[in-house]
Interface confidence: low
C-alpha cells in the first residue's frame, strides 16, 4: 500500500491513526512533525527528545513513502561515526544500503533529509529545520 | 498549533487522528492521499469521488500547513467558471482571497497545487498527479 496509489480499490477500510502528539502528522501509524525553527543537529535532537520523539529515521521506503513529497532540507537522525566510517541512526542501527542516496556536498558527520530519499552530508553545527518522528507501538 | 512549531511545550497530549481510509495521511483530522498516476482533472476528480473523497480543497493555512512542504504539482479541486470569472471549489464555495497565490502560466480552467500555497492555472485535460482529501466529521 503506497502513498502513491496507482488505483485504490473501494470500499476502503476506515481506521484511526496514532496515537500521536497533538497536531502531528500521522501516516501508517508513525507520527511526524516538521519544525521550521533552524537549529543545529544537537539542538534538533534535543528538541525531538524533549517531545518523546527522535529525529527522523528512514527505515522503509514503503512505510514512509510520504517522504518522497517533502521539499527543502531538514535534519534527520543519521550521523557518521568517524571511528569506523559507518552511518548510523540515533538508536545505533546501521543505515541500510538501499534506503537513502547519500550525497556528500559538505564535509560533516550529520545528514539532512531531502525529497525522494536523499541524504545530504552537512556540518552538524549548521542550523537547519528538522523533522521529528515518533513510532507508535 | 502549527505544523511548523517554533517550540512545542511538553507534555503533548497524545491523540488519535481520523478516521481515514487505510494508509492515508491524517493531519488535524483531515485525510490526504497523493496519487502518482497522472490523470486529467476530470479523471482525478472521479478517482477521488470513487474513494468517498474529493480533490484537495485549501480552506485554512493553519489547519493545512503541511501543504507548505509538498513538492511538485498536483491537481486540486479548484476550477474556473468561465461564464462568471470566479474560481470555485468542487463544493461550490468561492476561493478566499488570501489562501492561494494564483499564477497564470497556462490558459485553462483548472488549477494545480504547488508548495507554499500556490495554485498554477492549467488546461484541465493535461494529465497530472493529484491529491485527494477527505474531511472527517
Amino acid at each position: 500500500n503506497s502513498l502513491f496509489n496507482q488505483e485504490v480499490q473501494i470500499p476502503l477500510t476506515e481506521s484511526y491513526c496514532g496515537p500521536c502528539p497533538k497536531n502531528w502528522i500521522c501516516y501508517k501509524n508513525n507520527c511526524y512533525q516538521f519544525f521550521n525553527e533552524s537549529k543545529n543537529w544537537y539542538e534538533s535532537q534535543a528538541s525531538c527528545m524533549s517531545q518523546n520523539a527522535s529525529l527522523l529515521k528512514v527505515y522503509s521506503k514503503e512505510d514512509q513513502d510520504l517522504l518522497k513529497l517533502v521539499k527543502s532540507y531538514h535534519w534527520m537522525g543519521l550521523v557518521h561515526i568517524p571511528t569506523n566510517g559507518s552511518w548510523q541512526w540515533e538508536d545505533g542501527s546501521i543505515l541500510s544500503p538501499n534506503l537513502l542516496t547519500i550525497i556528500e556536498m559538505q564535509k560533516g558527520d550529520c545528514a539532512l533529509y531531502a525529497s525522494s530519499f536523499k541524504g545530504y552530508i552537512e556540518n552538524c553545527s549548521i542550523p537547519n529545520t528538522y523533522i521529528c518522528m515518533q513510532r507508535t507501538v | 498549533n502549527s505544523l511548523f512549531n517554533q517550540e512545542v511545550q511538553i507534555p503533548l497530549t497524545e491523540s488519535y487522528c481520523g478516521p481515514c481510509p487505510k494508509n492515508w495521511i491524517c493531519y488535524k483530522n483531515n485525510c490526504y492521499q497523493f496519487f502518482n498516476e497522472s490523470k486529467n482533472w476530470y479523471e482525478s476528480q472521479a478517482s477521488c469521488m470513487s474513494q468517498n473523497a474529493s480533490l484537495l480543497k485549501v480552506y485554512s493555512k493553519e489547519d493545512q500547513d503541511l501543504l507548505k512542504l509538498v513538492k511538485s504539482y498536483h491537481w486540486m479541486g479548484l476550477v474556473h467558471i468561465p461564464t462568471n470569472g470566479s474560481w470555485q471549489w468542487e463544493d461550490g464555495s468561492i476561493l478566499s482571497p488570501n489562501l492561494l497565490t494564483i499564477i497564470e502560466m497556462q490558459k485553462g480552467d483548472c488549477a494545480l497545487y504547488a508548495s507554499s500555497f500556490k495554485g498554477y492555472i492549467e488546461n484541465c485535460s493535461i494529465p497530472n498527479t493529484y491529491i485527494c482529501m477527505q474531511r472527517t466529521v
Epitope: - | 470569472g85 468561492i94 478566499s96 497565490t101 499564477i103
Partner: antibody, heavy 121, light 107 residues
C-alpha cells in the same frame, strides 16, 4: 460593456466621514472581488482592501486600522468604501477596480474613473 | 508586507528608444507581478500580468520578464503615446503592494 462608475468624493473637514461607491455594469458583480486603491497627489498607488460581491467577504490592508469599511449591495451591483476619522493624509484619488476573469483577485483589468477626496479645514 | 522597489523613478527618452524599467520585490513572489501604465488624470491600465503575459489589446512592443525577486518591463520602441508613469504590483500575497512608479518623459 463592462464598466465601473464611481461616486461620492468631495471636500471634507478633518475628522469627518465620507462614503464612496462603485457601481458595476456589464458583468456579474456577484462573482468578483471588488478592490479599492488610492493615490495621493503626485504619489504612487496604495491598496486599501477588497470585498467579494457575492459573499461580502472582506480583506483589508493592515494600515486601515478599522477606519475604513467595505460594504456591498448585491441588488444594486455596488461596492462602497466608508472612510471615517479622515485626516489630511487621506487626501487622494480613490479608485475601485475589478480583477480580470482569469487573474482572480490580485490583477486588475477594469478600473473606475476615480473619485477625489480632499481633507481640509 | 512585501516591499516593491522600482527603478529608475524617472527617465527621459526619445521616440524609438528602447526603455527598460526594473522592479525588485523584498521576497520571492513566484512570478506574480503585474505592470500598469498610468497617464495624468486617468486610472491605471494593465499592461503585463504574471510577469510576462501581455494583456489583451496591449501593443507587442511592451514585454515583461523576470522571476523570483527581480522583474523588468521593456518597451522595445518608445512611441509618443507611451509617455506616462509605470507601476509594478506584486500579486503574490495580501496586502497587495505597488512599486513607487517610473515616470517616462520626453527627452
Amino acid at each position: 460593456q463592462e464598466q465601473l462608475e464611481q461616486s461620492g468624493g468631495g471636500l471634507v473637514t478633518p475628522g469627518g466621514s465620507l462614503k464612496l461607491c462603485c457601481t458595476a455594469s456589464g458583468f456579474d458583480f456577484n462573482t468578483f472581488w471588488m478592490t479599492w486603491v488610492r493615490q495621493a497627489p503626485g504619489k504612487g498607488l496604495e491598496w486599501i482592501g477588497c470585498i467579494h460581491g457575492g459573499s461580502g467577504s472582506r480583506d483589508y490592508a493592515s494600515w486601515v486600522n478599522g477606519r475604513f469599511t467595505l460594504s456591498r449591495d448585491i441588488d444594486q451591483s455596488t461596492a462602497c468604501l466608508q472612510v471615517n476619522s479622515l485626516t489630511a493624509a487621506d487626501t487622494a484619488m480613490y479608485y475601485c477596480a475589478r480583477p480580470g476573469y482569469r487573474s482572480w483577485s490580485k490583477t486588475f483589468d477594469l478600473w473606475g474613473q476615480g473619485t477625489m477626496v480632499t481633507v481640509s479645514s | 508586507d512585501i516591499q516593491m522597489t522600482q527603478s529608475p523613478s524617472s527617465l527621459s527618452a526619445s521616440v524609438g528608444d528602447r526603455v527598460t524599467i526594473t522592479c525588485r520585490a523584498s521576497q520571492d513572489i513566484s512570478g506574480a507581478l503585474n505592470w500598469y501604465q498610468q497617464k495624468p488624470g486617468k486610472a491605471p491600465n494593465l499592461l503585463i500580468y504574471a510577469a510576462s503575459s501581455l494583456q489583451s489589446g496591449v501593443p507587442s512592443r511592451f514585454s515583461g520578464s523576470g522571476s523570483g525577486t527581480d522583474y523588468t518591463l521593456t518597451i522595445s520602441s518608445l512611441q509618443p503615446e507611451d509617455f506616462a508613469t509605470y507601476y509594478c504590483q506584486q500579486a503574490n500575497s495580501f496586502p497587495l503592494t505597488f512599486g513607487g512608479g517610473t515616470k517616462v518623459e520626453i527627452k
